[in-house]
């Protein structure tokens, strides 16, 4: 009775269960009753990352420097090349096919999370007591200056974009 289903790491072909090719190898010829599945290793610039019956290996991804990409991890016969973006850039998608410059946080906003090769800058509004007066991809919200610790008083209140202005305390007349 010919099989209708096969074990793990096997495939059904013409009423016969054949072994799949291991990662890093492609299918040359299906098995027979007498011969095991014929598989061949992928060439230098190719890979297959699963147990498979592919007759062609996949080409390694090219990290195009013209798109701001660089190699993060070189591909093997079993893994694809992993690209990342050059300094100051991040990927536009999960597959990282191109890069864009990191965004800066505008005045009134600070950097919550610094950008990486794969994620953009995350900004947050400066809460009360903090400010940012620059457009930056690195600077966090800074705390307002504490006038009291300098024996000074607040002359001008701070905002999310400006620091407080401190001044000397008014002397009380006798």
């Amino acid at each position: 009775e010919p099989p209708t289903a096969c074990r793990e790491k096997q495939y059904l072909i013409n009423s016969q269960c054949c072994s799949l090719c291991q990662p890093g190898q492609k299918l040359v010829s299906d098995c027979t009753e007498f011969t095991e599945t014929e598989c061949l290793p992928c060439s230098e610039s190719e890979f297959l990352d699963t147990w498979n019956r592919e007759t062609r290996c996949h080409q390694h991804k090219y990290c195009d420097p013209n798109l701001g990409l660089q190699v993060q991890q070189k591909g093997t016969s079993e893994t694809d090349t992993i690209c990342t973006c050059e300094e100051g850039l991040h990927c536009t998608s999960e597959s990282c096919e191109s890069c864009v410059p990191h965004r800066s946080c505008l005045p009134g906003f600070g950097v919550k999370q610094i950008a990486t090769g794969v994620s953009d800058t995350i900004c947050e509004p400066c809460p009360v007591g903090f400010f940012s007066n620059v457009s930056s991809a690195f600077e966090k919200c800074r705390p307002w200056t504490s006038c009291e610790t300098k024996d000074l008083v607040v002359q001008q209140a701070g905002t999310n974009k400006t620091d407080v202005v401190c001044g000397p305390q008014d002397r009380q007349r006798a």
Partner: antibody, heavy 117, light 109 residues
Framework: QVQLVESGGGVVQPGRSLRLSCAAS????????MHWVRQAPGKGLEWVAV????????YYAESVKGRFTISRDNSKNTLYLQMNSLRAEDTAVYYC??????????WGQGTMVTVSS | EIVLTQSPGTLSLSPGERATLSCRAS???????LAWYQQKPGQAPRLLIY???SLATGIPDRFSGSGSGTDFTLTISRLEPEDFAVYYC??????????FGGGTKVEIK
């Protein structure tokens, strides 16, 4: 390169025995089934026997069943055909050939067996 | 047992002409497991076509195979001097035995 080389042929009297060998090189012998095919002088091709890659399955043509035995030694990359009770009609060139799902893709050059008194 | 009948027995043609060889099976050949081989005098057979229509490695594309079920054809589009030889079909779907056709000789006219 991938190669099969037969040996062991010769002239033998009817009723006697002969053992043919087929030396394989250039491929992973232990993964492939192997066949013997013969060709009588001036005639067509006749399939003789097949053996599976690990040697557990063997099939024979009716004309040689009970007289011929196919075997293999994977440690020596060699296929054998033990031919007993030889008859005049066994006179032929004997080829070994590699089994694949594409048919017999590699053949040896053949060895001549002549059964004559 | 599947019996394969090849026709014609001999085909007399000139270089440059088209050759059409037939192979008929006594019962259906499953999965089109049919191969064609070329054999020249004093040489071993050489695999040309497998799976009825797939070209074997290193075989020039003037050779082509077609057919399914019980009727199969080998076509040589333009005969070259080196193509004059004997051609055999073989089924490898239903065994034992693996059967060959009787052969077609392609000779120079």
């Amino acid at each position: 390169q991938v190669q099969l080389v037969e040996s062991g042929g010769g002239v033998v009297q009817p009723g006697r025995s002969l053992r043919l060998s087929c030396a394989a090189s250039g491929f992973t012998f232990e993964k492939y089934g192997m066949h013997w095919v013969r060709q009588a002088p001036g005639k067509g091709l006749e399939w003789v026997a097949v053996i599976s890659y690990e040697g557990t399955k063997k099939y024979y043509a009716e004309s040689v069943k009970g007289r011929f035995t196919i075997s293999r030694d994977n440690s020596k990359n060699t296929l054998y055909l033990q031919m007993n009770s030889l008859r005049a009609e066994d006179t032929a060139v004997y080829y070994c050939a590699r089994d694949t799902s594409r048919g017999h893709d590699i053949w040896g050059q053949g060895t001549m067996v002549t059964v004559s008194s | 047992e599947i019996v394969l009948t090849q026709s014609p027995g001999t085909l007399s043609l000139s270089p440059g002409e088209r050759a059409t060889l037939s192979c008929r099976a006594s019962q259906s050949v499953s999965y089109s497991y049919l191969a064609w081989y070329q054999q020249k005098p004093g040489q071993a057979p050489r695999l040309l076509i497998y799976g009825a229509s797939s070209l074997a490695t290193g075989i020039p594309d003037r050779f082509s195979g077609s057919g399914s079920g019980t009727d199969f054809t080998l076509t040589i589009s333009r005969l070259e001097p080196e193509d004059f030889a004997v051609y055999y079909c073989q089924q490898y779907s239903d065994y034992p035995p693996f059967t060959f056709g009787g052969g077609t000789k392609v000779e120079i006219k």
